[in-house]
């Protein structure tokens, strides 16, 4: 009875077990009883990164930049090439296919966690004692201005959109 | 999975000959490539010959050819090998070995079963 399963990093062609091509090559001819698995390299803009039987290596992704992508990692012979995206955009998935521009947190929020090429912008409300009048991808909610401190009143209480107004302490007459 | 248990060595004068025998357990003995494979003492080991699963096809080290002789019963799960005009730089332990990969005769880490081994000594 011929084998029905192979070992580990060999494949059942023929009812005959052969070894798999390595990462990086791509199988040219199948073994026979007493001939080894032929493989060859990929070309420079191709990859296989498993070991295989596969007779085509896979074509390297392009990062287009027209899409706003640029290349974080060239590709090996082992590896595909990983895309990122340019400065003020991030990926609209995670295979990063194309980018988006990272969004701005409105007035009464503020920037948690600044964009990277990979995740946008989060934003969190200002909470009481703290402010933005800006819309920004980078700007945190400030804090209110403290009065006392320069020896004023509140004149005008803030919100989450603006800051406190300060005047000077009415004088008893 | 086969077991494989090796027989028929000895000491043997130069000149001598022999036959290994290499019984094999367990089932379809006839689709592993088998091989004799030796080691001299303090030496690697190393390729002697091979035969196909069929027997039709067998392979030699130049060192053993015209001498050495594989062969196999497939009907009794037996692997041979025949040794004549026997050297000293024949000493060794000889090992049987089975395969079901494709691969070149002598790549010895394509066997996947391997014998214990039966020590051939030739000495006067």
């Known amino acids: 009875e011929p084998p029905t399963a192979c070992r580990e990093k060999q494949y059942l062609i023929n009812s005959q077990c052969c070894s798999l091509c390595q990462p990086g090559q791509k199988l040219v001819s199948d073994c026979t009883e007493f001939t080894e698995t032929e493989c060859l390299p990929c070309s420079e803009s191709e990859f296989l990164d498993t070991w295989n039987r596969e007779t085509r290596c896979h074509q390297h992704k392009y990062c287009d930049p027209n899409l706003g992508l640029q290349v974080q990692q060239k590709g090996t012979s082992e590896t595909d090439t990983i895309c990122t995206c340019e400065e003020g955009l991030h990926c609209t998935s995670e295979s990063c296919e194309s980018c988006v521009p990272h969004r701005s947190c409105l007035p009464g929020f503020g920037v948690k966690q600044i964009a990277t090429g990979v995740s946008d912008t989060i934003c969190e409300p200002c909470p009481v004692g703290f402010f933005s009048n800006v819309s920004s991808a980078f700007e945190k909610c400030r804090p209110w201005t403290s009065c006392e401190t320069k020896d004023l009143v509140v004149q005008q209480a803030g919100t989450n959109k603006t800051d406190v107004v300060c005047g000077p302490q009415d004088r008893q007459r | 999975q086969v077991q494989l248990v090796e027989s028929g060595g000895g000491l043997v004068q130069p000149g001598g000959s022999l036959r290994l025998s290499c019984s094999a357990s367990?089932?379809?003995?006839?689709?592993?490539?088998m091989a004799w494979f030796r080691q001299a003492p303090g030496k690697e080991r190393d390729f002697v010959a091979a035969?196909?699963?069929?027997?039709?096809?067998?392979y030699y080290a130049d060192s053993v050819k015209g001498r050495f002789t594989i062969s196999r019963d497939n009907s009794k799960n037996t692997l041979y090998l025949q040794m004549s005009s026997l050297r000293a730089e024949d000493t060794a332990v000889y090992y049987c070995a089975a395969r079901r990969v494709g691969a070149v005769p002598e790549r010895e880490s394509a066997y996947e079963h391997w014998g214990q081994g039966t020590q051939v000594t030739v000495s006067s």
């Open positions: 367990g089932r379809a003995f006839n689709t592993y490539t």
């Open positions: 035969i196909s699963r069929d027997g039709t096809i067998t």
